[in-house]
């Protein structure tokens, strides 16, 4: 069953390479278990860069060596990717799986467009 | 680093199906991100399948998704590239390749240092 997803359009990263951006989903009922994944489009290429399982009112936990952090409020999943350079610009997308209890419903959203730009080096001083 | 040798080429018709393997020795395999590339004759090596080192990740290049999967069995030492509904511009040498780095946004930008001899997949009738 399909199931809206928003996330922002655009996002900044910092000059440290750290981007964050809220992923909100219209949960139909009372779901328990939740999967959030994010999605790189760019470069004719599709990336699962990070994953995440979560109980409702508990931590994210992440997949793998994630660059990928997060916390849950509600139907609101706060997520944030470190690491990142300016070859990293892309779209992101926001997909979430309702696991548990059935009926299994999935919303992908959009996608934020996130921009990275690395920090000019210091010029030498004297 | 990790030793690979690839299995599994063969000539397939259009539409068919094959499955390649990917068989490491040395190195602590599940240190490795693993990725398939491929070149066809007269062109550049081109980013295929990538999969993360527990194997909980992948990323695929847009003209094999849906169509190709990438799997590890890290126990085995063995990564594993299926292809289905092959067309003849799939046809090229398959190679696999080790990476000994985490998983970030651009896996087919990773450091690559371990490579295969690669396989040949031909697509024809």
């Known amino acids: 069953k399909a199931m809206h997803v928003a996330q922002p359009a655009v996002v900044l990263a910092s000059s440290r390479g750290i981007a964050s951006f809220v992923c909100e989903y219209a949960s139909p009922g009372k779901a328990t278990e939740v999967r959030v994944t994010v999605l790189r489009q760019a470069d004719s290429q599709v990336t699962e860069v990070c994953a995440a399982t979560y109980m409702m009112g508990n931590e994210l936990t992440f997949l793998d060596d994630s660059i990928c952090t997060g916390t849950s409020s509600g139907n609101q999943v706060n997520l944030t990717i470190q690491g990142l350079r300016a070859m990293d610009t892309g779209l992101y997308i926001c997909k979430v799986e309702l696991m548990y209890p059935p009926p299994y419903y999935l919303g992908i959203g959009n996608g934020t467009q996130i921009y990275v730009i690395d920090p000019e080096p210091c010029p030498d001083s004297d | 680093e990790v030793q690979l040798v690839e299995s599994g080429g063969d000539l397939v018709q259009p539409g068919g199906s094959l499955r390649l393997s990917c068989a490491a020795s040395?190195?602590?395999?599940?240190?490795?991100?693993v990725g398939w590339f491929r070149q066809a004759p007269g062109k550049d090596r081109e980013f295929v399948t990538a999969i993360s080192r527990s194997g909980s990740l992948k990323a695929y290049a847009d003209s094999v998704k849906d169509r190709f999967t990438i799997s590890r069995d890290n126990a085995k030492k063995m990564a594993y590239l299926q292809m289905n509904s092959l067309k003849p511009e799939d046809t090229a040498v398959y190679y696999c390749a080790g990476a000994p780095v985490p998983w970030g946004a651009r896996p087919s930008l990773f450091t690559y240092d371990s490579w295969g001899q690669g396989t040949q997949v031909t697509v024809s009738s």
């Open positions: 040395g190195r602590t395999f599940s240190n490795y991100t």
